[in-house]
């Protein structure tokens, strides 16, 4: 059997493989060792017994989408049946005091691989026995602690595979310089040690995306905006736009990034090198926001034209493909960050990203101020309570609701929240009466709201003992 027979249900074309060469990966035309690594079809009854105590689930994730030329990282995590975990030695053990369907286990081990490897790897003391190999026959790498790594992961995409020895969690990074744009499929098959052979325990696949557009996200924040996710904002208050570029492999770290904004309100283009920008709309209406991000990155230089070729025949590509050693680096110029060795040659690649949004601008409450506080004298039955009137003004649209949150002096522990509808005239002057239980210092957050906005003001207030001589004090506003 060949790798593509085992790992995929379709045979990939050599043309596709040639156009998607992944550095360090091998062609899935290579032979698969079925004696060491048995192959089970989906639905084969043997899957049921491939793991003691249930089925192992593999979860495959990636940091897709990836900008072409950047690295994309895939992570595989194994989820064991209930009460099982991997210990420091790579053995699979039962968690202490954990009860599953079979009850508490007397044997601490699900799989004691340490004991197995000591029994089976005595050959010439090197540990390089004929079974410590990957499915294509390549030997396991002998870095420190390799014996504690008991899972074999075979990654497969674009007609190529990558083999990795690991524990219950592995990561693999792939450079996308030679990957065809668009959605691609990554498939992973996981085997576990089983004496002197291996047993398949899980298969998983996931779609990843390679793009030539910088993945751009924009968050928008505006003070007093009631719902930041509805793309409705307030007139006459600045909106803060913050651009997030999805670049987990830091491919654009050495790029010069420019942000070109068009706010759709005839204020022209605004170009900046800062990822945040503030803009105030002064008219109501619907506006089309457009952002273009340009990253000027060092790119690979096309090789200089070769010298005139001798007329003797050279081997065909079909031949060279067969002998392609995936562990040797690709041809010069394949590295996406290779810089020119030719003086003054411009080897810059411009990458672009786009963001577009339609935003609605409406009237809103722009500002709230407490202009006066008055202690209201209480009748005798409530000697411990104080009634205080807050005289409040606002600017912008007319509020329909007022809320007060009374909390401790640090403004962290809420003691009381009261919201009530209000009917305010055009002057936007209202009085809010609130009760304070006992003397002391309080933090008062007062918000005025309507459908689209929520404006806040805060003050610290000192409520005196019920001594008529002691005045009410605003600690600070």
């Amino acid at each position: 059997k060949r790798f593509h027979d085992v790992l995929g249900n379709e045979r990939p074309s050599a043309y596709m493989r040639e156009h998607n060469q992944l550095n360090g990966w091998s062609s899935d035309e290579n032979d698969w060792n079925e004696k060491l690594y048995p192959v089970w079809k989906r639905g084969d009854m043997r899957w049921k017994n491939s793991w003691k105590g249930g089925r192992v689930q593999a979860v495959l994730t990636s940091d897709s989408p990836a900008l072409v030329g950047s690295n994309i990282t895939f992570a595989v995590n194994l989820i064991f049946p209930r009460c099982q975990k991997e210990d420091a030695n790579g053995n699979i053990v039962y968690e202490k005091n954990c009860r599953n369907e079979a009850g508490l286990s007397a044997d601490p081990y699900v799989y004691n691989w340490t004991a197995w490897s000591e029994d089976s790897d005595g050959e010439n003391g090197t540990g390089q026995s004929h079974h410590n190999v990957f499915p294509d026959g390549k030997p396991f790498p002998h870095h420190p602690g390799w014996r504690r790594w008991n899972f074999i992961y075979v990654f497969h995409t674009l007609g190529q595979y990558f083999q990795k020895l690991g524990r219950c969690s592995v990561r693999v990074s792939v450079n996308t310089a030679n990957v065809t744009l668009g959605p691609q499929l990554m498939e992973v098959t996981v085997y576990r040690r089983h004496g002197r052979a291996y047993v398949p325990i899980a298969q998983v696949k996931d779609v990843y995306v390679v793009t030539d557009q910088i993945p751009v996200f924009v968050t928008m924040f505006q003070k007093n905006d009631r719902n930041s996710s509805d793309e409705t904002f307030l007139k006459d208050l600045p909106i803060m736009f913050d651009v997030l570029i999805h670049d987990p492999s830091h491919f654009l770290n050495y790029s010069t990034i420019n942000y070109k904004w068009s706010f759709g309100d005839n204020t022209g283009l605004f170009v900046s090198t800062n990822h945040t920008v503030n803009h105030t709309y002064v008219l109501n209406g619907t506006f089309s926001l457009n952002l273009t991000v340009k990253a000027a990155a060092p790119g690979p230089c096309p090789p200089p034209p070769p010298p005139p070729r001798p007329s003797k025949p050279t081997p065909s590509l079909a031949t060279t493909l067969k002998s392609y050693d995936s562990n040797t680096p690709g041809p010069a110029g394949d590295n996406p960050l290779e810089l020119s060795r030719i003086p003054d040659e411009n080897c810059q690649i411009n990458r672009y990203g786009h963001f577009q949004a339609t935003i609605t601008i409406v009237e809103g409450i722009l500002e709230v101020n407490i202009i006066q506080m008055t202690d209201v004298l209480m009748p005798v039955p409530w000697p411990e309570s104080s009634l205080i009137d807050f005289v409040v003004t606002c600017q912008g649209s007319i509020p329909t609701e007022v809320c007060t949150i009374i909390s401790d002096p640090t403004c962290e522990i809420t003691q009381n929240t009261v919201c009530s509808p209000v009917d305010v005239d055009e002057m936007c002057l209202l009085t809010v009466r609130r009760t304070f239980n006992g003397s002391g210092t309080y933090c008062v957050n007062l918000t005025l709201g309507d459908d689209t906005s929520l404006a806040l003001t805060s003050t610290l207030i000192s409520v005196p003992d019920r001594d008529p001589a002691s005045p009410l004090r605003m600690a600070n506003s």
Partner: antibody, heavy 125, light 107 residues
Framework: QVQLQQPGAELVKPGASVKLSCKAS????????MHWVKQRPGQGLEWIGE????????NYNEKFKTKATLTVDRSSSTAYMQLSSLTSEDSAVYYC??????????????????WGQGTSVTVSS | DIQMTQSPASLSVSVGETVTITCRAS??????LAWYQQKQGKSPQLLVY???NLADGVPSRFSGSGSGTQYSLKINSLQSEDFGSYYC?????????FGGGTKLEIK
């Protein structure tokens, strides 16, 4: 929209060389391979070779390995094909074509999805 | 190199008829095949990719089929603008060779 612009005609002398150009617009030039195809009068299409517009990597038809040299200039989004030691056999229309890709399951598929108008090369003394 | 054999080399048909052009590969190309149309004095245009998928803007009277080594392009109810030459091309390996072409002429 995606366009590949080629000059209409070139008249060259036997033994000389000619450099044909193909200017791309309407797409990200470096994201696509560029192909070159030969068509002699009244004949079919013959694949010459292809170049990766991003890194300059090339693949050639064995038949054209000593005849054609493919290059790109990313700054102007232009692909070039130089034909050397020209003879009357090289008189033909030469097309550049973009290699398009289509998502397949599980692998992408390819086809030449956009062609230039072709440059007619006449080799004559 | 994979040889692509197209047949017939030419055919003469009337508007409204249905025609089928075939393309045989010298080895299995697993549906990695494209069809192009070329009108007199013009550059080729992509019709079909991956053996069966119509390219954008191609009328539905065109259809591609086949697998393994045998592929065909069918044109239902031929229109006057369909006359010209048709080529298949494989993308199984390098070089991606073309078929010899089929010339479709008005009867």
């Amino acid at each position: 929209q995606v366009q590949l612009q080629q000059p209409g005609a070139e008249l060259v002398k036997p033994g000389a060389s000619v450099k044909l150009s193909c200017k791309a617009s309407g797409y990200t030039f470096t994201s696509y391979w560029m192909h070159w195809v030969k068509q002699r009068p009244g004949q079919g299409l013959e694949w010459i070779g292809e170049i990766n517009s991003s890194n300059g990597r090339t693949n050639y038809n064995e038949k054209f390995k000593t005849k054609a040299t493919l290059t790109v200039d990313r700054s102007s989004s232009t692909a070039y094909m130089q034909l050397s030691s020209l003879t009357s056999e090289d008189s033909a229309v030469y097309y550049c074509a973009r290699l398009g890709y289509y998502s397949g399951s599980p692998y992408p598929y390819y086809a030449m999805d956009c062609w230039g108008q072709g440059t007619s090369v006449t080799v004559s003394s | 190199d994979i040889q692509m054999t197209q047949s017939p080399a030419s055919l003469s048909v009337s508007v409204g008829e249905t025609v089928t052009i075939t393309c045989r590969a010298s080895e299995n190309i697993y549906s990695n095949l494209a069809w192009y149309q070329q009108k007199q004095g013009k550059s080729p245009q992509l019709l079909v990719y991956a053996a069966t998928n119509l390219a954008d803007g191609v009328p539905s009277r065109f259809s591609g089929s086949g697998s393994g080594t045998q592929y065909s392009l069918k044109i239902n109810s031929l229109q006057s603008e369909d006359f010209g030459s048709y080529y298949c091309q494989h993308f199984w390996n390098t070089p991606p060779t073309f078929g010899g072409g089929t010339k479709l002429e008005i009867k």
